[in-house]
Amino acid sequence: TLNSVLNSNAIKNLPPPLGGAAGHPGSAVSAAPGILYPGGNKYQTIDNYQPYPCAEDEECGTDEYCASPTRGGDAGVQICLACRKRRKRCMRHAMCCPGNYCKNGICVSSDQNHFRGEIEETITESFGNDHSTLDGYSRRTTLSSKMYHTKGQEGSVCLRSSDCASGLCCARHFWSKICKPVLKEGQVCTKHRRKGSHGLEIFQRCYCGEGLSCRIQKDHHQASNSSRLHTCQRH
């Protein structure tokens, strides 16, 4: 249980953000690879791709959504599919790649700040009580941000990306969730891994900015898989 792992600062003190919004398809944030706690399954990397069965979008990586692999296929057989790029057809926001959303059946850019607040974030309620385990369950929640009068600046607390000023997204940062900058070229990013467990991810990063994608750093191929760095690079 959590109490056996967190032996020092009492779990009662854990802020909601530590169980807060994890990145999901269509969201502005990406979870940095965290340490998987006891009881968690190992992440399955995207690099050696295999069909990954799922029941909902949250079980897939941020660059994926959950759906039947064939048009009009059996709804009972769903796998994680690659997200749809800009101008591709869609039926819901989660189908579109990070930085985009589904509008009138087409994936369009959500870089403009007007939409970001409408993107729901997944709240992993792993820390509801003293008996909670690390295998939390998640549900979709639309968080109200009416309490925020002005857009949050870099480092200020937030509930969701719409609370943050333009060029920032709301992402977990150890103790809290704060407004962080959208990533620039060369900055460290997170290559999304499948959510094979609800491991506690204590850092999240925003997505790479326009014209950039998160790819392995060229001079880090010799490093072990678990510690390879990815950076935002030009397409």
Epitope: S8, L14, E154, S176, I202, S226, S227, L229
Partner: antibody, heavy 113, light 108 residues
Amino acid sequence: QVQLVESGGGLVQPGGSLRLSCAASGFTFSSYWMSWVRQAPGKGLEWVSVISSDSSSTYYADSVKGRFTISRDNSKNTLYLQMNSLRAEDTAVYYCARHGIDFDHWGQGTLVT
Amino acid sequence: DIALTQPASVSGSPGQSITISCTGTSSDLGGYNYVSWYQQHPGKAPKLMIYDVNNRPSGVSNRFSGSKSGNTASLTISGLQAEDEADYYCQTYDQIKLSAVFGGGTKL
């Protein structure tokens, strides 16, 4: 611009108490987590405690747990550190730091001996 | 406990480049790719120079850069200048104790 000014340091006997204050200005104080970090003379930095923007969460280093209490008054833009049962090893400069993306702004510190 | 190990001192000449290392373990630096760096001049408050491995806050010279490989993070200062003479600290977080952790510091 962001400004953090600590006060309340001084000379105190072992076992005594002291309350440090940190006056914040130049930013929306109530929107940021805040921390105390200390530095013993000639030594490195040691994180002491952190408090959430709304005071609902607090965390402490093992070395001060049960003796120090962090608090804040958002209406006064002030951070506090109540230090009880002080020991010789608590001698240090105590810095107030804003915890945005890490410790992004620091005060000049107040010396506790 | 998490401990970040830094060399006690590093030296260089004006115009040169130097690198300061910060070594952790697979369960901290190696595990979640997060480290920050601070500069502290004698008698002054620390200043955040690099966050999240290689990000510079606004106002920090691009002569300062960060990187990480495996369990070791590095701060590189190119084109050394006299005003770079200071103490440098790396910092990460301990997810078990829910605390922030600093390295022992390196005198440049």
